[in-house]
Structures are given as C-alpha cells and as structure tokens.
Amino acid sequence: AILGRSETQECLFFNANWEKDRTNQTGVEPCYGDKDKRRHCFATWKNISGSIEIVKQGCWLDDINCYDRTDCVEKKDSPEVYFCCCEGNMCNEKFSYFPQMEVTQPTSNPVTPKP
C-alpha cells in the first residue's frame, strides 16, 4: 500500500567537486531509472564553523528510507556530513537540519542553499 506518493522526475543538481568530476557545477538533473523503481532527490552538505558548504545535490536511487518524505530534512544528531532525501520534483532545492533525538525537543535550522 502506498499513500499519496509524488513522482520525482527532476532534481536540483550541484557538485562542489565539479571540475575534478568533470560535471556541471549546478543545474537541473533529470532522474532516470527502471519503471518499477522510485526516484528521489538528495542533498549533502557540511557545517564548517557555522558556514554551510554544499557537497552535492541531485537524483537518488530508489531507497525506502526516502519514501513519504516530501521535504529534504536531516534528522540525525550532529552528523559529520549532513544528508537528506525526499520525493517530488526539485524537493532538494531547500534542505534543513532538524535533529530529533530520543529525549530532547528538536530545534529547526532551515537552510536555503546558495551554490
């Protein structure tokens, strides 16, 4: 059973390592994949002394942990590299850090990337 699923056909693309990887630095990435597989968008970034450094954004392969996530939100507490994934076109355009620990109340830190 799948409720209210949104198709992902394209995602915001960004690669901080674009010269070495020989890719574009930024743009829109069409998401390809098998017909029976779902597609997602993702974002990875670092927080260097309070400054947000985007590592990559783009399409992400079918992953059950991305299902039913309409917003790109990292919920892990203090990760080394922040990661989020989501479903829906360009849903990785904005991403946020919203740590949800077992006991303490979460605080939201939304981030709008400026590549």
């Epitope: 597989k37 392969l61 942990n65």
Partner: antibody
Amino acid sequence: EVQLLESGGGLVQPGGSLRLSCAASGFTFRNDAMSWVRQAPGKGLEWVSGISVTGGSTFYTDSVKGRFTVSRDNSRNTLYLQMNSLRAEDTAVYYCAKVYYTSFFDYWGQGTLVTVSS
Amino acid sequence: QTVVTQEPSFSVSPGGTVTLTCGFNSGSVSTSYYPSWYQQTPGQAPRTLIYNTNTRSSGVPDRFSGSILGNKAALTITGAQADDESDYYCVLYMGSGIWVFGGGTKLTVLG
C-alpha cells in the same frame, strides 16, 4: 545503544492469528524505515515486510500478502506485524530490523519464535 | 519471481582467501540494488557486514570487503579465521520496498 526487542511469538493453530511487536530504543524510531525478516527452522533468511518512516507505504513478500499487516506507532517507538490465517509454513523466528539509507538492515533484534501447529 | 543465488557451501583454509558471490535470475547485479551482506552463526541474530556494495559496517574488520565481480555482488574474506565459520547471506534491494535474500552460503574454515 540501539535495541530492538521482539515479542508476541508463541504456539498457534493453523488459521489462527498472532500480533508481533518490536520495541525500539537507542535511536529516533520515527526517522527510519523498518522491516520484518523471518527464518524457518534450519532454513535461510526471508524478507517478510517493510514500512516507510511515516507508515504510509507498506510492502510484503508474495506469500504473506493479504494475511499479514505491518504497522508502526511512532509515538510508542513500536513496530507491529499482525499475522492472520497462519499456516504451518509461517513457522519461523521473526526478526525486526532497522533500515538505513541505501536500504540495508543496520540493526537486528534477537527474534521471536512463531510456531504454527495443530 | 526473482531468485537470488549464492553458493550453498564453501571451504577455506585458515589464513586463506575466499570470495562468495551473489547473483540473480533477472540479469546483472549492480550497485543500484544496494547489495548487502550479513553473517549469522547458529542461534544468533544476523550481523551486518557490508552495505551499499562495498561499505563495511561499524566494527567489521577490514578482512571483509564487498564488490561487484562481473554480473554478481561479491564478499571477499582475506586471512580467514576460525570464527569466520558461519552462514553468509546477501540481500538485494529490488526497489519499490522489496528485498530478496539469497539462500545463504555455509562457510567452513578447515582445520
């Protein structure tokens, strides 16, 4: 420390029902997809069911479709497997497993034994 | 129906190297199936060894490595030890919320 504790197993007659529970602790339950995997005596592992973070998407192996229902209560940090119309071939140890990005099972419970016999 | 195949059994000498493989009947295994590997000793819950083709799980010794070999996923154990004697299972994530386990490989460490 991540802990997954299954309960609810036992002896049941063919055609009967059981509800398995998996109590999760040591991580933020509502952030991760979850799954059930079983192992019949002397046999290999078999994936049974999976559920997304919200519970909005549920998935089953063909042999249990229409008989088993997976659900989760994110406020209680608990995963469930409602098993109806049980058959002898459902006899197995049932494990709950936490699923992480790239869809792998990163933590496992110790399992609960379900025996279907008359 | 997708069937994931593994060698039913394998033997290795202590200190030797063994490669277990994982294929399926519908084509080639690629990284898009997120192959993962699990070790299980009798009466115990499975232990996660390798995920996402080649990433070692926390606490897993670097004697264990994962890869794609030809059209199969592979688990290589180098410098095999007596306590590596276990059952090893590969899992492929088929997408759309579905996983398929291989039948498992029973690894015997000789001697």
